[in-house]
C-alpha cells in the first residue's frame, strides 16, 4: 500500500513545551485496545496536565487518559479505528496543544517472544524461530519482522534480515566458526496499519561449531 511517509513517522505537535507522541496497541488485552502518550521533553512539569481524546470513538464523544507516572494511558474497546481523533493536552478545561491522529497509523506491535536457534548438522545451517501474539489477533495480523544478529564481541556490527514469516535460516558458512552470537527480533505493521517498531524480543545466544580440520570446511 502506498503511504505518505515511512512507517514510524509521526505527526509532531506544535513546537512548544507540550510536544508529545503517542502509539496505539490493538487487541492488547483481549478485545481491548490501548493508547499511550508521553511528552517529548522529560522535564515537563506534568502535575496538572491531562490528556483527552475526542472523535472517532464508539458511543462516546471523548475519553480521558489515566496518568501512570510519566505516561498517559487509555485501555478501551471504544476506538472506532476509522477517521482521525483529536488528542489534546489540557490543563483544566483549556487545551494547550492538540494533534489530529488516525490511530491506525501509530500502531506499535507487541514484542516477539520465544526466540530460539537450532543448529542442523546435516544441513550446515541454523534455523531461527520465534513467536508473535499477532498471529492470534484479528486486526494487526500482518507484520514485517526485523531479525538482528551479531558476533558478541562486535558491539555495533548488527546484521539485519527482514522477513514476513516467523522462521529464518542462517547458513553456517555466513557465520564465523567457534563464535558466540547474539540474536534478537522486533516487528512492525505491514498491511494497512502503520506505525512503529515493537520493542526487541529478549536476546538469544548461540555458539557456532568449530571448523572441521580434515577438510578445512565447517561442518
Amino acid at each position: 500500500e502506498s503511504g505518505y511517509a515511512q512507517n514510524g513517522d509521526l505527526e509532531d505537535a506544535e513546537l512548544d513545551d507540550y510536544s508529545f507522541s503517542c502509539y496505539s496497541q490493538l487487541e492488547v488485552n483481549g478485545s481491548q485496545h490501548s493508547l499511550t502518550c508521553a511528552f517529548e521533553d522529560p522535564d515537563v512539569n506534568i502535575t496538572n496536565l491531562e490528556f483527552e481524546i475526542c472523535g472517532a470513538l464508539v458511543e462516546v464523544k471523548c475519553l480521558n487518559f489515566r496518568k501512570l507516572q510519566e505516561i498517559y494511558f487509555i485501555e478501551t474497546k471504544k476506538f472506532l479505528l476509522i477517521g482521525k481523533s483529536n488528542i489534546c493536552v489540557k490543563v483544566g478545561e483549556k487545551s494547550l496543544t492538540c494533534k489530529k491522529i488516525d490511530l491506525t497509523t501509530i500502531v506499535k506491535p507487541e514484542a516477539p517472544f520465544d526466540l530460539s536457534v537450532v543448529y542442523r548438522e546435516g544441513a550446515n545451517d541454523f534455523v531461527v524461530t520465534f513467536n508473535t501474539s499477532h498471529l492470534q489477533k484479528k486486526y494487526v495480523k500482518v507484520l514485517m519482522h526485523d531479525v538482528a544478529y551479531r558476533q558478541e564481541k562486535d558491539e555495533n556490527k548488527w546484521t539485519h534480515v527482514n522477513l514476513s514469516s516467523t522462521k529464518l535460516t542462517l547458513l553456517q558458512r555466513k557465520l564465523q566458526p567457534a563464535a558466540m552470537y547474539e540474536i534478537k527480533v522486533r516487528s512492525i505493521p505491514d498491511h494497512y496499519f502503520k506505525g512503529f517498531w515493537s520493542e526487541w524480543s529478549p536476546s538469544y545466544y548461540f555458539r557456532t561449531p568449530e571448523i572441521n580440520n580434515s577438510s578445512g570446511e565447517m561442518d
Epitope: 500500500e1 503511504g3 505518505y4 513517522d9 505527526e11 476509522i82 486486526y139 494497512y192
Partner: antibody, heavy 118, light 111 residues
C-alpha cells in the same frame, strides 16, 4: 466553514501540462491529507493520488506515476496537482478532496474542468 | 486493482419508498470489524458528497434515512424513504488498498 477552492477551467493542447490549485480554509491545513480525484465526462470517479501537507509526502495511483506531481505550499494552505503529457483522455473535471480518514473524502472542492483538445 | 461492481446501474423508486444499492468488491475490504467501504452522493454539476464511511457510519449532517451495511465483499446503501432531493448518482469506494477505487455509480430517480 471548511472549504476547498480550486482554480478555474483550463484548455490545453495534447502534450502540454496543466497545474490545478486547491486552497484550503476553515481548518488547520496540516491536519488532513488532500487528494485528487478526476471524473471524465459522463463517467465515474478515479483516484489520482494524495499529499500529506505536513510532510509533503505523496502517494500516487500507479496509472499516473511519472505524469502527475502533487505539491503543497503551507504558507498559503494550497496544494497543487500538475499533470503532464496531456492527451484527449485526460479531459475531465478534477476535484481536490480532503481525507477525513484513511482514505475517504469528507470535503470536496468545486472541481476544475480541464479540456485537452488540438 | 480492487474492482467495485454496483447494482443496479439505475433505480426508479416512488417517493417515500425504500431504495437499495449494492456494491460488490473483487476482494475483501474488511479487516475484522473495520470495513473500508464508503458511499457518496453526486448531483449534476456538483462534487460528490460523503454519506457513509466505514460501511455504516453516518457522516455528520447527513439525514438518517441513509444507512449502510455489509462486510468483506458485499455492501449495501439504503435510503429508507426516498425524498425528491435524493435524486442523484451514488458511488461506493474502497480504501483498503491503493489505488483507492470507486464503483461505476447507481443513478437513482423518482418513479
Amino acid at each position: 466553514q471548511v472549504q476547498l477552492v480550486q482554480s478555474g477551467a483550463e484548455v490545453k493542447k495534447p502534450g502540454a501540462s496543466v497545474k490545478v490549485s486547491c486552497k484550503a480554509s476553515g481548518y488547520r491545513f496540516t491536519d488532513y491529507e488532500l487528494h485528487w480525484v478526476r471524473q471524465a465526462p459522463g463517467q465515474g470517479l478515479e483516484w489520482m493520488g494524495g499529499i500529506d501537507p505536513k510532510t509533503g509526502g505523496t502517494a500516487y495511483n500507479q496509472k499516473f506515476k511519472g505524469r502527475v506531481t502533487m505539491t503543497r505550499d503551507t504558507s498559503t494552505s494550497t496544494v497543487y496537482m500538475e499533470l503532464s503529457s496531456l492527451r484527449s483522455e485526460d479531459t475531465a473535471v478534477y476535484y481536490c478532496a480532503r481525507s477525513g480518514g484513511r482514505w475517504y473524502f469528507d470535503v470536496w472542492g468545486q472541481g476544475t474542468t480541464v479540456t485537452v483538445s488540438s | 486493482d480492487i474492482v467495485l461492481t454496483q447494482s443496479p446501474d439505475s433505480l426508479a423508486v416512488s417517493l417515500g419508498e425504500r431504495a437499495t444499492i449494492n456494491c460488490r468488491t473483487s476482494e475483501s475490504v474488511s479487516i475484522h470489524l473495520l470495513h473500508l467501504m464508503h458511499w457518496y452522493q453526486q448531483k449534476p454539476g456538483q462534487p460528490p458528497k460523503l454519506l457513509i464511511y466505514g460501511a455504516s457510519n453516518l457522516e455528520s449532517g447527513v439525514p438518517d434515512r441513509f444507512s449502510g451495511s455489509g462486510s468483506e465483499t458485499d455492501f449495501t446503501l439504503t435510503i429508507s424513504s426516498l425524498q425528491a432531493e435524493d435524486v442523484a448518482v451514488y458511488y461506493c469506494q474502497q480504501s483498503i488498498k491503493d489505488p483507492y477505487t470507486f464503483g461505476g455509480g447507481t443513478k437513482v430517480e423518482i418513479k
